[in-house]
């Protein structure tokens, strides 16, 4: 079997989680693809995931969550911006493959996000310049929801990884006409 | 094939302004953003800015700010940067570079570059 | 602004060596590091992308690792068209910052 192995990342609360996942090119390009939560004894939980097929460099946005997945370079981008404390957990990038089970990416990620502000900033915490608002658009992409004994992913419930609320914008550099999915509640 | 073909050396005055044209081709110019990069004779590589070729975002480097403008026009596949109020410690070449990512700057570097244009400034 | 810092500054190395050069962030950029070469009088070459990811059509004898705020590019064994000079730059936070730089000459 794989030894599943884990990266950590330990961050204070408000600073910004920014990973990437690599995957193989070819297959994976214009697959979906999505961000999950992995609670102890529980299924996989997914938070986010692309458009299907997944458009290039295009940004989507769920609650605090950004995907963008870069199909010339097999890999995701995954922001998990303003952290909270209840966000600490182990995360996974998968790519969906129906009817298949979702492909998992490696590494998992370990998040520790702990109180108070260091003044140093952490993953990402960008101090720019020029700040644009995401503006409040949607998208017809939806994460499918799988139900194999093994892997389980639904749609982001209102408590899992304290994902905002649709009406939420958050500011990052540059960043118009985002493609932004709606929380389901 | 893809390449950034830009606009030929210049000599300014100090105070003037000068345009440097980027013209892209073998690529979907929209896809990506344009960065600018110059480099000073002898120094190292310094970022002046970024613009979206998809919808003409920018950010400059806070100690240019107030002093170039870059755009685009999608017409032609073509990026421009001004530079105003030119100092003699802005004699450089200047190079632009595409980057992936339509949005956000360039997350995973600058992989296309021009061939550079020369900038003097010299009374 | 992230601070970035190369060292060394300048390395003398024969053909065949294999050459290491690092780059420390002021501050975490996670994986989000570039590594460009450039020789005298030629733009900038992008080599790795994200940290380890190596640019279509670059050599596998470059390579990329780190994560954080500390990061190496190491050239397993160097060729004469690898004398040049090296730059790394974090790509994540506004403004983009480059290294001072690396220069690789012939010993």
């Known amino acids: 079997a794989t030894k599943l192995t884990e990266e950590k990342y330990e961050l204070k609360e408000g600073q910004t989680l920014d990973v990437k996942c690599d995957y193989t090119l070819e297959k994976f390009a214009s697959s979906q693809k999505a961000w999950q939560i992995i609670r102890d004894g529980e299924m996989p939980k997914t938070l986010a995931c692309t458009e299907r097929p997944s458009k290039n460099s295009h940004p989507v946005q769920v609650g605090r969550i950004i995907l963008e997945d870069y199909h010339d370079h097999g890999l995701l981008r995954v922001r998990m911006v303003n952290l909270q404390v209840e966000d600490s957990g182990l995360y996974q990038c998968v790519i969906y493959q129906p009817p298949k089970e979702p492909h998992m990416l490696f590494d998992r990620i370990r998040l520790v996000v702990t109180k108070g502000f260091s003044g140093t900033p952490g993953s990402n915490e960008n101090s720019t310049q020029n700040v644009y608002k995401i503006p409040p658009t949607t998208t017809k992409a939806l994460c499918p929801l799988y139900t194999s004994p093994r892997t389980v992913t639904q749609a982001p419930p209102k408590s899992t990884a304290d994902v905002s609320t649709p009406d939420s914008e958050i500011n990052l550099t540059n960043v118009t006409d985002i493609i932004r999915v709606p929380v389901f509640n | 094939q893809v390449q950034l073909v830009q606009s030929g050396a210049e000599v300014k005055k100090p105070g003037a302004s000068v345009k440097v044209s980027c013209k892209a081709s073998?690529?979907?110019?929209?896809?990506?953003?344009i960065s600018w990069v110059r480099q000073a004779p002898g120094q190292g590589l310094e970022w002046m800015g970024w613009?979206?070729?998809?919808?003409?975002?920018?950010n400059y480097a806070q100690k240019l700010q107030g002093r170039v403008t870059m755009t685009t026009d999608t017409s032609t596949s073509t990026a421009y940067m001004e530079l105003r109020s030119l100092r003699s410690d802005d004699t450089a070449v200047y190079y632009c570079?595409?980057?992936?990512?339509?949005?956000?700057?360039?997350?995973?570097?600058?992989?296309?570059w021009g061939q550079g244009t020369t900038v003097t400034v010299s009374s | 602004d992230i601070q970035m810092t190369q060292s060394p500054s300048s390395v003398s190395a024969s053909v065949g060596d294999r050459v290491t050069i690092t780059c420390r962030a002021s501050?975490?950029?996670?994986?989000?590091l570039a590594w460009y070469q450039q020789k005298p009088g030629k733009a900038p070459k992008l080599l790795i992308y994200?940290?380890?990811n190596l640019q279509s059509g670059v050599p596998s004898r470059f390579s990329g690792s780190g994560s954080g705020t500390d990061f190496t590019l190491t050239i397993s064994s160097l060729q004469p068209e690898d004398f040049a000079t090296y730059y790394c730059?974090?790509?994540?936070?506004?403004?983009?910052?480059f290294g001072g730089g690396t220069k690789v000459e012939i010993k």
């Open positions: 570079a595409r980057g992936a990512g339509m949005y956000d700057g360039s997350p995973l570097g600058m992989d296309v």
């Open positions: 073998g690529y979907t110019f929209t896809s990506y953003g």
């Open positions: 613009i979206s070729a998809y919808n003409g975002n920018t």
């Open positions: 501050q975490g950029i996670s994986s989000w």
């Open positions: 994200a940290a380890s």
């Open positions: 730059q974090q790509a994540t936070a506004h403004p983009p910052t």
